[in-house]
């Protein structure tokens, strides 16, 4: 167990030109506050996937009022740090979400308005009971400077806070094999009692005889890393060989959610939907009233006056869960065309469209045959994205305006000699054969295999092919 | 700004048959996409039937088979035609869509209609 903090220094206008605009006015008083959203691993997860790690809401910073005339300075922030609590053990590796949120002090109906200024995101690697490390973030104009650090909760210690401390028995020294607790020199590491054969890498406990998995890893004594890619169901065959998660307990059994949550699996680990009132990994914190600002994406809080009773936030169309935390999948509706692939940004969708295609749907054929002329008579075709002119007879090319030899093509049969002519190409035939092509053949008597030659030509004769 | 209107909601046993309408009014719009997603209680709100921005229906898969979406062009209205319905449906319907507005996409919820199904 232990504590994440966040120490917010300062929040304005980044370097470089296009300077923002102050959130707040004269008219519009303002005053910020800060969320963070902790997640486990590196993970590129969506913003809207639950805090499995834990979130915390700052405190509101002083009023500001915007003093006409001047830049958008620093923004006075809220006193004090994020914290965030852990429970188990720290994963080393984690993604965090940190969003500034206005507050708006007009004459709001229905109380002060909330809406987001910025959002910024990054994956850090980190061990627990390092020094603060700092940081500096982007969101468009804007610039989030901030330090962070992971740290243990007695008796936890180490880089993960999977080691128990205890104080000294002796004053000396520790007991046999057990090391003394740094930098809680005066501590020492607590006797080995998680299950025998507990994998130390992969394990940890925090009662006596168990053996608790780190992410990524199952089994009785954590030794068998999940590989759900050839398992059957979630929890699959068991199989040392296909290292697909044992059979057993799901994370669901026990309902791990705490006041009334209820639990749903997810491919990782567990979900706890809350009730009103309550949030957490585990629906374990409670006692949040309007005044806390619970409600995000702009939802409105309704009840909850005091901690005693639940607050019920009104989404806005498109957000969801009990806090509003979460995106309505609006792409799933998948509203690009053409095969562009869909981007829901919140404040709009958005489709990045396939080459060849264009438009805020990639409804627009870049080159279909709008505005294009086939030369020379000859007609356009559309299809799959692209267009080709279908030429007349005697020319070529991608918009006909290349002459053709139509004798390149060898189109005379049986030895025909092949003449270019102004309205197309004219075989003259061998001896014996006859026809546009000279593809029939003269009888010995003089008939051929036409029913009946054209008027005018005799087998011979030169033919020529409109 | 366009208005959606869904109807035909209610209360239904198991394996019974209910169907959804969903319209679509306003004045110079033209749908690009429009399709139902359901909610139920302490749930997301998940994509269940609809017409993509290619006019290709596309459904979820828990009810593939069961569920079938239609339109009528003239009347800017979707259907959801749902049978063999199971308790694991009741949840509050929405009509979504992408619609064109001038030169401008937006996206429009409707209210919703309760689906209940229950022995």
């Known amino acids: 167990a232990g504590v994440f903090e966040l120490q917010i220094h300062s929040f304005g206008p980044g370097p470089g030109p296009g300077a923002p605009r102050s959130p707040c006015s004269a008219r519009l008083p303002c005053r910020l506050f800060f969320r963070v959203c902790l997640k486990p691993g590196l993970s590129e997860e969506a913003a809207e996937s639950p805090c499995a790690l834990g979130a915390a809401l700052s405190a509101r910073g002083p009023v500001y009022t915007e003093q006409p005339g001047a830049p958008a300075p620093d923004l006075p922030l809220p006193d004090g740090l994020l914290q965030v609590p852990f429970r188990d053990a720290w994963p080393g590796t984690f993604s965090f979400i940190i969003e500034t949120w206005r507050e708006e002090l007009g004459d709001q109906i229905g109380g002060p308005a909330w809406s987001l200024l910025a959002r910024v995101a990054g994956r850090r690697r980190l061990a627990a009971g390092g020094p603060w490390a700092r940081d500096i973030q982007r969101a468009g104009a804007w610039e989030l400077r901030f330090s962070y650090r992971a740290r243990c909760e007695p008796p936890a210690v180490g880089t993960a806070c999977t080691r128990l401390c205890r104080p000294r028995s002796a004053p000396s020294r520790c007991g046999p094999g057990l090391r003394p607790c740094a930098p809680l020199e005066d501590e020492c590491e607590a006797p080995l009692v998680c299950r025998a054969g507990c994998s130390p890498e992969h394990g940890f406990c925090e009662q006596p005889g168990e053996c608790r998995c780190l992410e990524g890893w199952t089994g009785p004594l954590c030794t068998v890393p999940v590989s759900t890619s050839s398992c059957l169901s979630p929890r699959g065959p068991s199989s040392a060989t296909t290292g697909c998660l044992v059979p057993g307990p799901g994370p669901c059994d026990g309902n791990p959610c705490a006041n009334g949550g209820s639990c749903s699996e997810t491919p990782r680990s567990f979900e706890c939907t809350c009730p009103r009132g309550f949030y957490g990994l585990r629906c374990e914190v409670s006692g949040v009233t309007c005044a806390d600002g619970p409600c995000f994406n702009g939802g409105l809080c309704v009840g909850g006056a005091d901690p005693d009773s639940a607050y019920i936030c009104h989404c806005p169309p498109g957000f969801q869960g009990s806090n509003c935390e979460k995106r309505v999948d609006r792409c799933s509706l998948q509203p690009c065309r053409n095969g562009g692939l869909c981007l829901d940004l919140g404040h709009a969708l958005r489709c990045r469209c396939r080459a060849g295609f264009a438009g805020p749907r990639c409804e627009h054929d870049l080159d279909d045959c709008a505005g294009r002329a086939c030369a020379n008579g000859g007609t356009c075709v559309e299809g799959g994205g692209a267009h080709r002119c279908s030429c007349a007879l005697g020319f070529g090319g991608r918009d006909c305006r290349e002459r053709a030899d139509p004798c390149a093509a060898r189109p005379c049969a049986h030895g025909g000699r092949c003449y270019a002519h102004f309205s197309g190409l004219v075989c003259a035939c061998a001896p014996g054969y006859m026809g546009a092509r000279c593809e029939f053949p003269v009888h010995p008597d003089g008939a051929s295999a036409l029913p009946a030659a054209p008027p005018g030509l005799r087998p011979g004769d030169p033919q020529r092919y409109l | 700004e366009v208005q959606l209107v869904e109807s035909g909601g209610g209360e239904v046993q198991p394996g019974g048959s209910l169907r959804l309408s969903c319209a679509a009014s306003g004045s110079d719009f033209s749908i690009n996409a429009i399709g139902w997603y359901r909610q139920a209680p302490g749930k997301q709100r998940d994509m269940v039937a609809g017409f993509t921005g290619d006019t290709v229906t596309t459904y979820a898969e828990s009810v593939k088979g069961r569920f079938t979406i239609s339109r009528d062009n003239a009347k800017n209205t979707v259907y959801l035609q749902m049978s063999s319905l199971r308790a694991e449906d009741t949840a509050v319907y929405y009509c979504?869509?992408?619609?064109?507005?001038?030169?401008?996409?937006?996206?429009?919820w409707g209210q919703g209609t309760l689906v209940t199904v229950k022995p």
């Open positions: 979504a869509a992408d619609v064109k507005i001038g030169g401008d996409y937006e996206w429009f």
